[in-house]
């Protein structure tokens, strides 16, 4: 069987010879050199060599426990002649003993940490950690103690844990923001002869809201023209706050003053300025100066600092409204006028009125924008704004005329304004009714009396208020002895009826019927229209088979006998 115990070896051996580890030995070894000892495993043949005859093991190199604390090797004892193992292969351990050859090393060369300003004494800042590569299970080589080398009286460190805490009351960021603390970690429990390492901790005081906003001046004055539309910026005011970030954010508001309804203040988030803007239209002629009270406040307030006073400040803003020469103002936004279509030239339609709103009340002259009245149908009295016709109108040509009137200050022609005029042309009965289409019909030779051969329709360009009412009749010259009659249907239509039984196309192939159409308006308008009736041969169903076309080719002299 094998005869050995666990081998121990001191690290960092500095002797000139190889370091003796121990002896492998089998009780089968007769000491005659018949056995060969073989070493395999961690570092065999390199770090550890064996005398194959005696089993003595030596370390060839300086060993570092921190690099490798334990080596696991295997031993064989073999009969040199046969190769036959005299013992089972066995595993053994070489354990490296620790010396204090490593200083504590911080996990970071430089730590960065933050803590709120004005923190209570003992507030946690950061924990630093140093590790010592030496053996923590043996002696105090790896027992680390922390101390502060730089950074008192502001900060302290817990010796066992490395926790850094605040040590001074009311540390004010606005006074000093950055601190550099140096911490030492020493092994051997901090005793003499221990190895040490240091780290730097850069501590930044973070801001808290312990400063109110302050206006640098108590009064601001701005000017703005009365023409400034709502939303126009007038000026900027800025309060300063010694804090930073959201603790320095400022909200501006108008709290008082006669301009409370006329102006707004908005906060520019980028610059933290208050922008005074116009809220409602200004009028120099009504009010020339406004006074506002503007307040700057922190939206986020820390209750524990309220004892320092209110976190707001106010300033007075004086706004001077400047006069602006304004264009004339019409009495209406638009005018609607009416005129009959039979109005004579120079007939007055109506009038427009415009006034200079300025205190000067400059006189105004009127004109028609000719781009809107190219045909010069209308004109205006430049002095009093009366609108009149300069040409005859026709409702049936154009019902509405849309023109623009310009009012210009006589003393300052650059100041002008415009207003739309909508002129409606009213209807007059000045058009006679007429046939809706050209009528050409036929009658069968074998037609019976009182047979309807055509229905007549009429149209009228006029547009009477109560609607059209047409009447139809044969012209007086054709009324007696006519071969056809006109029947007025009293619904703005009429029918042509046969008056006898049978027509002979060889005797008379075409009839021309003059029909009088009248309207029912004032003054009555009428016209005469002619209906052509051809006599045709028809089948027994009344369908036309053939007609003479002479009436179309030679219409003269054919109206007689209708």
């Amino acid at each position: 069987s094998w005869m050995w115990n666990q081998f121990f070896l001191l690290e960092e051996y500095t002797g000139s010879d190889y370091q003796y580890v121990g002896k492998l030995h089998s009780d089968q070894d007769r000491g005659d050199g018949s056995l060969k000892y073989i070493l395999s495993g961690d570092g065999a043949g390199d770090l550890f060599i064996i005398n194959e005859n005696t089993g003595d093991i030596q370390a060839t190199k300086r060993l570092d426990r921190e690099e490798k604390p334990v080596y696991i090797l295997r031993a064989q004892a073999i009969n040199r002649r046969t190769g036959r193992p005299v013992e089972p292969e066995s595993e053994f351990i070489i354990k490296i003993h620790d010396i204090n050859d490593n200083e504590p090393i911080f996990t970071k060369e430089v730590y960065t940490a933050t803590v709120p300003e004005m923190s209570d004494v003992g507030t946690f800042v950061v924990q630093v950690t140093a590790t010592d590569a030496d053996d923590p299970t043996y002696g105090n080589s790896a027992k680390v103690v922390y101390s502060i080398l730089q950074g008192q009286p502001y900060f302290s460190v817990e010796s066992e844990t490395g926790i850094i805490k605040t040590a001074l009351l009311n540390m004010d960021r606005e006074n000093r923001e950055q601190y550099q603390v140096v911490i030492q970690a020493k092994d051997m429990g901090g005793q003499m002869g221990g190895l040490s390492g240091t780290t730097t901790v850069n501590i930044t005081l973070t801001d808290v809201n312990d400063n109110p906003p302050r206006f640098p001046q108590s009064t601001y004055q701005f000017k703005t023209p009365e023409s400034s539309p709502p939303g126009t910026p007038i000026g900027r005011i800025k309060a300063s706050d010694a804090d930073v970030g959201e603790n320095a954010e400022i909200e501006y508001s108008i709290t008082d003053g006669e301009g409370l309804d006329m102006f707004d203040v908005i906060t520019d988030q980028e610059t933290q300025e208050g922008i005074i803007t116009v809220k409602k239209l200004l009028d120099f002629e009504k009010k020339k100066v406004y006074t506002l009270k503007v307040e700057a406040s922190n939206p986020y307030v820390e209750p524990r600092f309220l004892y320092l006073g209110p976190f707001k400040d106010s300033a007075t803003v004086r706004i001077v409204v400047e006069d602006v020469d304004e264009p004339p103002v019409f009495s209406k936004l638009a005018y609607i006028l009416q005129i009959r279509e039979d109005a004579q030239i120079n007939t007055t339609i109506g009038s427009v009125t415009a006034q200079d709103p300025d205190a000067a009340r400059n006189p105004v002259k009127y004109s028609v924008d000719r781009h809107t009245d190219m045909d010069r149908i209308f004109n205006i009295d430049s002095g009093n704004g009366s609108i009149f016709t300069s040409k005859l109108l026709d409702r049936e040509t154009l019902l509405w005329h849309n023109i623009t009137v310009i009012a210009t200050e006589i003393n300052n022609p650059k100041q002008s304004s415009r207003v739309p005029l909508y002129i409606k042309v009213l209807d007059v009965n000045d058009n006679a009714p007429e046939f809706a289409e050209f009528y050409e019909t036929f009658v069968c030779e074998k037609a019976k009396a009182d047979q309807l051969i055509q229905t007549l329709h009429a149209v009228d360009k006029d547009d009477p208020y109560s609607g059209h009412q047409f009447s139809f009749s044969l012209a007086p010259e054709a009324a007696s002895g006519s071969n056809f009659t006109i029947q007025d249907n009293k619904d703005n239509t009429a029918g042509i009826l046969t008056r006898k039984n049978g027509y002979n196309r060889h005797e008379m192939s075409t009839y021309l019927l003059p029909v009088v159409i009248s309207d029912n308006d004032y003054p009555v308008q009428s016209s005469t229209g002619t209906v052509t009736v051809r006599v045709c041969a028809c089948d027994h169903h009344g369908n036309m088979q053939s007609c003479h076309a002479e009436a179309l080719i030679h219409p003269t002299g054919l109206s007689t006998g209708a």
């Epitope: 050199g33 060969k36 040199r80 046969t82 190769g83 036959r84 292969e89």
Partner: antibody, heavy 117, light 111 residues
């Protein structure tokens, strides 16, 4: 470089003896056993015996125990194998071989021994 | 004595083929995880050359296409891809017990 150089071929009469030498170089002669193996024409390998040069301890196969003698001269790093009472069936190539943990890692070039009347 | 039975006694294979030779010992040649079986190559007119020792260990300088395995009584020698220069007779040998004995040999030829 390890080398084993054997003596030259021998022709012997039946009943006589033969002594074959094997000179070693390129290693520590005393640290390794020396073995003798023979091979009859067209036949396989046959182990005859071995010697520990440091103590002259020998082992022989039963077949040759009475006829074979293995010796060494440490001063010249030479091993010898003597076979007596030769017969025709002893005609073979005789090899010396270095032994290391039961294996033959280096061999001599072989010596042909012919037994003929 | 431990008898070594090697098979086949001869074989013919093509270049690139996988060749396997077996050797059976009449009793176990293994102890404490060490297998005292070794393999040799012998070319005509030349002494044998050690290829594999202790059943599976490749001797220094021997090509990796040669390998060995096995334990106790049954052992295998393999050429993974036969090459023309591998034409030879191959022997197994045990050193477990005196007298040390060889297998009868396997002659390997190229088809």
């Amino acid at each position: 470089e390890v080398q084993l150089v054997q003596s030259g071929a021998e022709v012997k009469k039946p009943g006589s003896s033969v002594k074959v030498s094997c000179k070693a170089s390129g290693y520590t002669f005393s640290n390794y056993w020396m073995h003798w193996v023979r091979q009859a024409p067209g036949q396989g390998l046959e182990w005859m015996g071995d010697i520990d040069p440091s103590h002259s301890e020998t082992h022989y196969t039963q077949k040759f125990k009475d006829r074979v003698t293995i010796t060494v001269d440490k001063s010249t790093s030479t091993a010898y194998m003597e076979l007596s009472s030769l017969r025709s069936e002893d005609t073979a190539v005789y090899y010396c071989a270095r032994g290391d943990l039961g294996r033959f890692d280096y061999w001599g070039q072989g010596t042909t021994v012919t037994v003929s009347s | 004595d431990i008898q070594m039975t090697q098979s086949p006694s001869s074989l013919s294979a093509s270049v690139g083929d996988r060749v396997t030779i077996t050797c059976r010992a009449s009793e176990s040649v293994s102890i404490h995880g060490t297998h005292l079986m070794h393999w040799y190559q012998q070319k005509p007119g030349k002494p044998p050359k050690l290829l594999i020792y202790a059943a599976s260990n490749l001797e220094s300088g021997v090509p990796s296409r040669f390998s060995g395995s096995g334990s106790e009584t049954d052992f295998t020698f393999t050429i993974s891809s036969l090459q023309p220069e591998d034409i030879a007779t191959y022997y197994c040998q045990q050193s477990f017990e005196d007298p040390w004995t060889f297998g009868g040999g396997t002659k390997v030829e190229i088809k």
